[in-house]
């Protein structure tokens, strides 16, 4: 081993680097003292360092190593925070757009239902966006308001208009006639399989991303024990008080001390790597009916068949319900009494076609790809941060903790720091309580996001068929789940290009009954000519 | 015509339980959230539970959260507000109120005449 | 859940315009949410004036109006009457879906 170069006889350069971290050098000495008071420093011969210089080394380590930590996290942390937002922003996007195309339907094809129509959209899409948000509403309950509250009017305006206004408070009446009779057919239940599968993925899908902000916030603001900031101050700063002030830590030195302090975060690796992989699979099942962009962006056409199937079966209905709500008065009970069956729309439903350029889609997948890029963050960050502080290549001529060596040996320098303080200590505290809730909430929402991600065995698909989701009705695989029939084919151009249309507000108000709508005009919606043009099949 | 009549209240002292029940007549009961509010004598409305047309959903005030418990039989046309470890601050007058909608809260445009609850040793 | 915030009292001649505040906070009033308002006489129910931020419900005079903006909303009556010397409560809810009342205003007729 090679001698220690002589100490600086007069601590002056110690003097003039402490002299940066705390103004004033009440507390350095002139001359390089004993140290016998010194605890992380332990001193081989005379030192330039005091107790209390040795306190704010500590603080200063621990202030380091926290801002080395959230610089490693940085852009992890902007990825996230960033497209959180811009999800977010864009979900809202599409409802805006999904409601306006629902009110434009409402206003070309049954100008008779507006105002009203125009009210119980927006509540209902208004109730959507809630539920995207976290809100705990039933999707089932607030399909069936859309169609309970428009039944009456439909019933009033266009199929009985000759009804006095003392008429109307059969309102009731058509109001639980509504479900019994089916008078919809099954689109309300289409409609619940496709809003309640897309929103609630979606809604997961947001949950999953504020959660990753949370697991980075939590560890980018850790604060490190006090043996960590002893450790951290050994490696860092105790050579400055041998006067050697140019030497830098070994590499391995360095790498042995950060997975000691950072042991405790470590253990989040497991649960973020599970975390992005699950989100993968989220996002790759995000297609279909669990898009909500493609679910959504189709409502106005399926609520159009809806109505169109009412019409149909205009003549059985009016007769039923004439005898059925003859005196609404006294009609105090869900009806028992069935019709025989009503006429059924067999027509298959189409596909609405999507000509993706930059949807929500393939910014989606463009994240995944970026996350996956951090899914070694965690058991990586020992690492990154040494090779982000200043640190000796190839471990020669470095400093071990203790003294100036030539070459780094991991045993040694553990030896030497027996005495001083236990590595293996450290790592058996186990991680900090601010960790171990994170840990949980990420094994929470991975156990959902599996959950959701299972293609034939969704949550959503057990559930509905505890409501009695009829086997007719539309399953997993069946395209035409996702748009009604319209007049053909609803071929949506570019269907949101939805990165260079986000801060283009489409709603003037977004209060119930608001006059100002999106009108469609020469088979497109001219309101939408940002995003394209939208060619609908309403006439 | 639409209608709302609430029963079951009562003195009764802290700490035992009570049982509200609403009677609804002249609306489809089943296509609507019910909620129940109370006012304290001389104080404001408060809100205390809601629960969505089909009963899968129920809301409630932080404040007798864990202690009541809503409910509702769609085939009595009945909705019901069961108050268990009452305490004296539990004392007014509790409506029973239709909403307008079936989702969940939003406007309450029919409500009943009230009943009489005082918590009391 | 903290109540939405109204002034307490509130007055005007027969005639005059009187108009009732009501402020929340983004995850109420501020929300995707709805503000309603209610009108109740002493010893009575309350009834329902205002729903959907500024719709009523049919017969309610055209004399009530309501607003909304951010996370403030306001009751407006025009042309006062007697009878509408009553208390006055705003109501919506907030992303719990848990429905927060103002503590009311006592509107007087001079």
């Known amino acids: 081993q090679p001698p220690p170069p002589p100490p600086d006889a007069t601590c002056h350069q110690v003097r003039s680097f402490f002299q940066r971290l705390q103004p004033g050098l009440k507390w350095v000495p002139e001359t390089p003292v004993p140290g016998s008071d010194l605890q992380v420093c332990l001193p081989k011969g005379p030192t330039c360092c005091s107790r209390k210089m040795e306190e704010k080394y500590q603080l200063t380590a621990r202030l380091n190593m926290e801002q080395l930590l959230q610089s490693a996290s940085m852009e992890l942390k902007f990825l996230i925070i960033q497209n959180a937002a811009v999800f977010q922003e864009a979900f809202e996007i599409v409802v805006r757009h999904a409601k306006n195309y629902t009110n434009a339907m409402f206003k070309n094809n049954y100008p008779s239902l507006t105002p009203q129509a125009f009210e119980f959209v927006g509540e209902f899409f208004t109730d959507v966006s809630l539920y995207i948000l976290g809100s705990d509403i039933n999707v089932d309950d607030m399909v069936n308001e859309l169609f309970d509250s428009l039944f009456p009017v439909i019933y009033t305006q266009l199929m009985n208009p000759g009804l006095p206004d003392s008429a109307l408070d059969i309102n009731e009446c058509l109001r639980g006639a509504r479900r019994d009779l089916k008078v919809f057919g099954n689109f309300p239940k289409l409609i619940m399989t496709q809003v309640s599968k897309s929103l609630q993925v979606t809604r997961i899908f947001l949950q999953a991303l504020n959660l990753g902000i949370e697991v980075i916030n939590t560890t980018d603001h850790l604060k490190f024990s006090k043996d960590c900031g002893r450790m951290l101050t050994r490696m860092w700063y105790c050579s400055y008080c041998q006067g050697l002030m140019m030497v830098k830590p070994c590499g391995g030195y360095c790498n042995v001390v950060m997975q000691g302090c950072m042991a405790g975060v470590v253990e989040i690796d497991k649960y973020w790597r599970e975390y992005i992989l699950s989100l993968e699979e989220l996002v790759n099942g995000m297609y279909r009916i669990y898009d909500m962009e493609n679910v959504l962006l189709g409502l106005f056409s399926t609520i159009h068949d809806s109505i169109q199937y009412v019409q149909k079966n205009a003549g059985k209905l009016t007769t039923t319900i004439g005898k059925l709500c003859a005196h609404s008065q006294q009609r105090q009970y869900r009806s028992a009494y069935y019709p025989e069956d009503l006429f059924i729309d067999k027509k298959v439903l189409k596909v609405a076609h999507v000509e993706h350029e930059e949807t929500l889609s393939s910014r989606r997948r463009e994240l995944i790809q970026k996350l996956k890029s951090f899914i070694s963050f965690y058991s990586a960050l020992p690492g990154y941060i040494c090779s982000h502080s200043p640190v000796a290549e190839n471990d020669t001529l470095c400093w071990n903790g203790q003294e100036l060596v030539e070459r780094y040996s991991q045993k040694a320098a553990r030896n030497g720091m027996k005495n001083q303080f236990n590595l293996h200590e450290l790592k058996m505290k186990g991680p900090e309580p601010v960790v171990s809730q994170i840990i949980d909430k990420l094994k929470h929402i991975n156990q959902l996001l599996r959950t959701m991600s299972m293609p034939k065995g969704r949550v959503l698909d057990k559930n509905l068929d505890e409501e009695g989701f009829e086997s007719g009705d539309c399953g997993d695989d069946e395209d035409e789940c996702i748009g009604g029939s319209g007049d053909g084919m609803i071929k949506v151009k570019n269907q949101l290009r939805f990165l260079a249309e986000l801060a283009y507000d489409l709603d003037v108000d977004d209060a119930p009954g608001n006059s100002q709508q999106a009108t469609p005009k020469d088979n497109e919606i001219s309101t939408f000519h940002n995003l394209g043009n939208v060619h609908s099949p309403l006439k | 015509q639409v209608q709302l009549q609430e029963s079951g209240g009562g003195l009764v002292q802290p700490g035992r339980s009570l049982r509200l029940s609403c009677a609804a007549s002249?609306?489809?009961?089943?296509?609507?959230?019910m909620a129940w509010v109370r006012q304290a004598p001389g104080k404001g409305l408060e809100w205390v539970s809601e629960?969505?047309?089909?009963?899968?959903?129920?809301y409630y005030a932080d404040s007798v959260k864990g202690r009541f418990t809503i409910s509702r039989d769609n085939s009595k046309n009945t909705l019901y507000l069961q108050m268990n470890s009452l305490r004296a601050e539990d004392t007014a007058v509790y409506y029973c109120?239709?909403?307008?909608?079936?989702?969940?809260?939003?406007?309450?445009?029919?409500w009943g005449q009230g009943t009489l609850v005082t918590v009391s040793s | 859940q903290s109540a939405l915030t109204q002034p307490p009292s509130a007055s005007g001649s027969p005639g005059q315009s009187v108009t009732i505040s009501c402020t929340g906070t983004?995850?109420?009033?501020?929300?995707?949410?709805?503000v309603s308002w209610y009108q109740q006489y002493p010893g009575k129910a309350p009834k329902l004036l205002i729903y959907?931020?500024?719709n009523r419900p049919s017969g309610v005079p055209d004399r009530f109006s309501g607003s909304k903006s951010g996370t403030s909303a306001s009751l407006a009556i025009t042309g006062l009457q007697a009878e509408d010397g009553a208390d006055y409560y705003c109501?919506?809810?907030?992303?719990?879906?848990?429905?927060?009342f103002g503590g009311g205003t006592k509107v007087t007729v001079l």
């Open positions: 109120a239709k909403d307008r909608r079936g989702s969940h809260a939003d406007a309450f445009d029919v």
């Open positions: 983004s995850s109420d009033v501020g929300g995707y949410n709805y």
């Open positions: 109501q919506s809810y907030d992303s719990s879906l848990r429905v927060v």
């Open positions: 002249g609306f489809t009961f089943s296509t609507y959230a």
């Open positions: 629960i969505s047309s089909s009963g899968s959903r129920t």
């Open positions: 959907g931020n500024s």
